[in-house]
Amino acid sequence: DTEIKVNPPQDFEIVDPGYLGYLYLQWQPPLSLDHFKECTVEYELKYRNIGSETWKTIITKNLHYKDGFDLNKGIEAKIHTLLPWQCTNGSEVQSSWAETTYWISPQGIPETKVQDMDCVYYNWQYLLCSWKPGIGVLLDTNYNLFYWYEGLDHALQCVDYIKADGQNIGCRFPYLEASDYKDFYICVNGSSENKPIRSSYFTFQLQNIVKPLPPVYLTFTRESSCEIKLKWSIPLGPIPARCFDYEIEIREDDTTLVTATVENETYTLKTTNETRQLCFVVRSKVNIYCSDDGIWSEWSDKQCWEGEDLSKKTLLR
């Protein structure tokens, strides 16, 4: 019995299409596959950012695979051919590994790259990113922001830069169509006549950095002699009611502070007839049903009641 062997894939490479971290891994079939014409060859692909402890593993029949990477670090990948047991009258046969790496040659020292990058997707409508210039860079240094997400033909540059002392320190993004629930890639590079500037790469998903507007139209309704219902409305904008969590702060007679987190636009408060003043504020955040993370809104305007009308049916500001 001759031992069945198979070659690794050919021309294994990592291709950068200019999408700021979304890379193509591609290869060609191995040599000498003539013996296995009736067989569907599979490939086991392993890849990771250099420095990561774990490999991502994919088994595919295709000759390419795409995924996002952190271009601040290098990338390593390896692939081998798999012959399923059906093709070999027995156990699965694997080729040796073909390996490849990819990295962007870093320009400039790390301190020249932008510092404290911060991006917020206000009310799921307006993306604003801001940063601080690199440490020790001169005023002639300017930074440029590029972004890409699946659906764009190519990476786009920021339309509206925020400036300080003539330097770009932020970006207001234009309308971003169909951009949530997918990776959003950003590169901030720079130029200076004095020294090279290190580029920085960032990846996030927009729904996870949403800061909603605060709730509006806060009202009180007396439900019973010892219960008051606090109500409010979702803010104007594209975020549906089902996506909100709320945090309430309630003060009774300037002493008791109640805080609560609720999923609906109402909260029922137990009170006594002795209550002379009631104030509350609410803030909102996108909940776990619509995102993995989020930013609390500012607090709403305070809604207060003072006097003896707390026993009446409805109390508005």
Partner: antibody, heavy 119, light 111 residues
Framework: QVQLVQSGAEVKKPGASVKVSCKAS????????MNWVRQAPGQGLEWMGR????????DYNQNFKDRVTITRDKSASTAYMELSSLRSEDTAVYYC????????????WGQGTSVTVSS | EIVLTQSPATLSLSPGERATLSCRAS??????????MNWYQQKPGQAPRLLIY???RQGSGIPDRFSGSGSGTDFTLTISRLEPEDFAVYFC?????????FGGGTKLEIK
């Protein structure tokens, strides 16, 4: 509830200056550009300039030849537009109007401030 | 500066009809894959109201009967079925470059 509340009507003599204020509320003042637009009686709209409250960066319409000055007080969420060397053709309603970046247009407008220039 | 020419200057139509307003720019207002063209409605004694931004995106709270189209130098605002409250003056505006400029306006009046 976004609101832009402008200062009251003004009557000025030719050669004088006028300063119009615009108090913003209901949103984060520094996140949006603030534009100034004027409209002479029965006429169209004329963009005068804009300020980025985030950093104070300003763009002017050069048609006003250094007569216009736009400023902001971030702590008071207020923008100001001052027009100097007034002439009769500056008689108009002056609007402040916010917009998020150049690709979004101008989505909220103040109620307008009437400025009359007459001797 | 970019000059915007609106046509017609006046448009007389009846409620229920379709209105088509045109705006032509003296040079392209496209950049970064975006058309920097906006449309506003203004009624007497009121501030303008944003209808359409980036040529085709509806402003907040704008009814679906308002739509925008076009790119480069030629843009159109369409009101699919006129309501009585739609009779007003409509302005186009470019925000591609400073100074931002407005068209002269189209007055939409009841026939």
């Amino acid at each position: 509830q976004v609101q832009l509340v402008q200062s009251g009507a003004e009557v000025k003599k030719p050669g004088a200056s006028v300063k119009v204020s615009c108090k913003a509320s209901g949103y984060t003042f520094s996140n949006y550009l603030m534009n100034w637009v004027r409209q002479a009686p029965g006429q169209g709209l004329e963009w005068m300039g804009r300020i980025d409250p985030y950093d104070g960066d300003i763009d002017y319409n050069q048609n006003f030849k250094d007569r216009v000055t736009i400023t902001r007080d971030k702590s008071a969420s207020t923008a100001y537009m001052e027009l100097s060397s007034l002439r009769s053709e500056d008689t108009a309603v002056y609007y402040c109007a916010r917009g998020y970046g150049t690709a979004y247009g101008v989505d909220y407008w103040g109620q307008g401030t009437s400025v009359t220039v007459s001797s | 500066e970019i000059v915007l020419t609106q046509s017609p200057a006046t448009l007389s139509l009846s409620p229920g009809e379709r209105a088509t307003l045109s705006c032509r720019a003296s040079e392209s207002v496209d950049n970064y894959g975006i058309s920097f063209m906006n449309w506003y409605q203004q009624k007497p004694g009121q501030a303008p109201r944003l209808l359409i931004y980036a040529a085709s995106r509806q402003g907040s709270g704008i009814p679906d009967r308002f739509s925008g189209s076009g790119s480069g130098t030629d843009f159109t605002l369409t009101i699919s079925r006129l309501e009585p409250e739609d009779f007003a003056v409509y302005f186009c505006q470019q925000s591609k470059e400073v100074p931002w400029t407005f068209g002269g306006g189209t007055k939409l009046e009841i026939k």
